[in-house]
Amino acid sequence: CKAMHVAQPAVVLASSRGIASFVCEYASPGKATEVRVTVLRQADSQVTEVCAATYMMGNELTFLDDSICTGTSSGNQVNLTIQGLRAMDTGLYICKVELMYPPPYYLGIGNGTQIYVIDPEPCPDSDF
């Protein structure tokens, strides 16, 4: 089989500070040295890119400075963290993995992680 399998958790609950973390694991059919990981958000039938990073195997995962994502990599596993989430950002977040180099190229699409975000209740006014 030439398809690359990508696994990610079905559901994740964001913290009260709007931070959600999940692991994206891929079964690499080849020995890739350059990998690109993209987080996509699917709402209805619309798919948008949340963040993306390309890394060399053995090196750290680096997202752009203004990205809402951070991550670390270990072998065929990527630990992703998305921050700044609000209730309106609740949705399905898909992990996409591309083995860019060396040939052949492989594409792997996860089934998605449903991230639930609950906005914290505002603190009641204090009499003190």
Epitope: K2, M4, T48, T54, M100, G108
Partner: antibody
């Protein structure tokens, strides 16, 4: 409007060269990998070449390897295909295509005709 | 290289009837990586189905895809006059990206 527009096709003699261009508009070009696909007259679709987001990774069909070179200029929102040592069997309509975020080719140009004949 | 074989080569159907097109892969293709395209004379291909069964934006629900592994199917439930065209399957899970040879759906 989200679109791709190819140019640069024409009539060229065997052994000659041609450079195709594809102008992208209406989307963030650098966020997508791109392809060239061709279609010989009366035939099916044949994938020709792929280029990564930053242009560092390129793949080619065996039929064009060593003769064709794909490149991109993200600042100009443009994709290119340099075709050298052209043969009669390279005669086809050449399409540039965008890879959607989930992998299939979701946006195609109108195509540009390349005819290789003496 | 994954070779895709489409059948039949030509399908003659009357408007309003059902059309079933087949695409067989030489080795297993993950269902997330199989697409169908429609092409009319003088036009560029148009994406119909991706991920074996998901309809692309703006594609009417008379088009549906199914299958997994090596066998995939595109079904057009009730052929409209504008559906007479050539249909291609494609795998995009690994390089080289490959297309089937096409099935022409013509008016009976």
């Amino acid at each position: 409007e989200v679109q791709l527009v190819e140019s640069g096709g024409g009539l060229v003699k065997p052994g000659g060269s041609l450079r195709l261009s594809c102008a992208a508009s209406g989307f963030t070009f650098s966020s997508y990998t791109m392809h060239w696909v061709r279609q010989a007259p009366g035939k099916g679709l044949e994938w020709v070449s792929f280029i990564s987001y930053d242009g560092n990774t390129k793949y080619y069909a065996d039929s064009v390897k060593g003769r064709f070179t794909i490149s991109r200029d993200n600042a100009k929102n443009s994709l290119y295909l340099q075709m050298n040592s052209l043969r009669a069997e390279d005669t086809a309509v050449y399409y540039c295509a965008r890879t959607s975020l989930l992998g299939p080719f979701d946006l195609w140009g109108q195509g540009t005709m390349v005819t290789v004949s003496s | 290289e994954i070779v895709l074989t489409q059948s039949p080569g030509t399908l003659s159907v009357s408007p309003g009837e059902r059309a079933t097109l087949s695409c067989r892969a030489s080795q297993s293709v993950g269902s997330s990586y199989l697409a169908w395209y429609q092409q009319k004379p003088g036009q560029a291909p148009r994406l119909l189905i991706y991920g074996a069964f998901s309809r692309a934006t703006g594609i009417p629900d008379r088009f549906s895809g199914s299958g997994s592994g090596t066998d995939f199917t595109l079904t057009i439930s009730r052929l409209e006059p504008e559906d007479f065209a050539v249909y291609y399957c494609q795998q995009y899970g690994s390089s080289p990206w490959t297309f089937g040879q096409g099935t022409k759906v013509e008016i009976k």
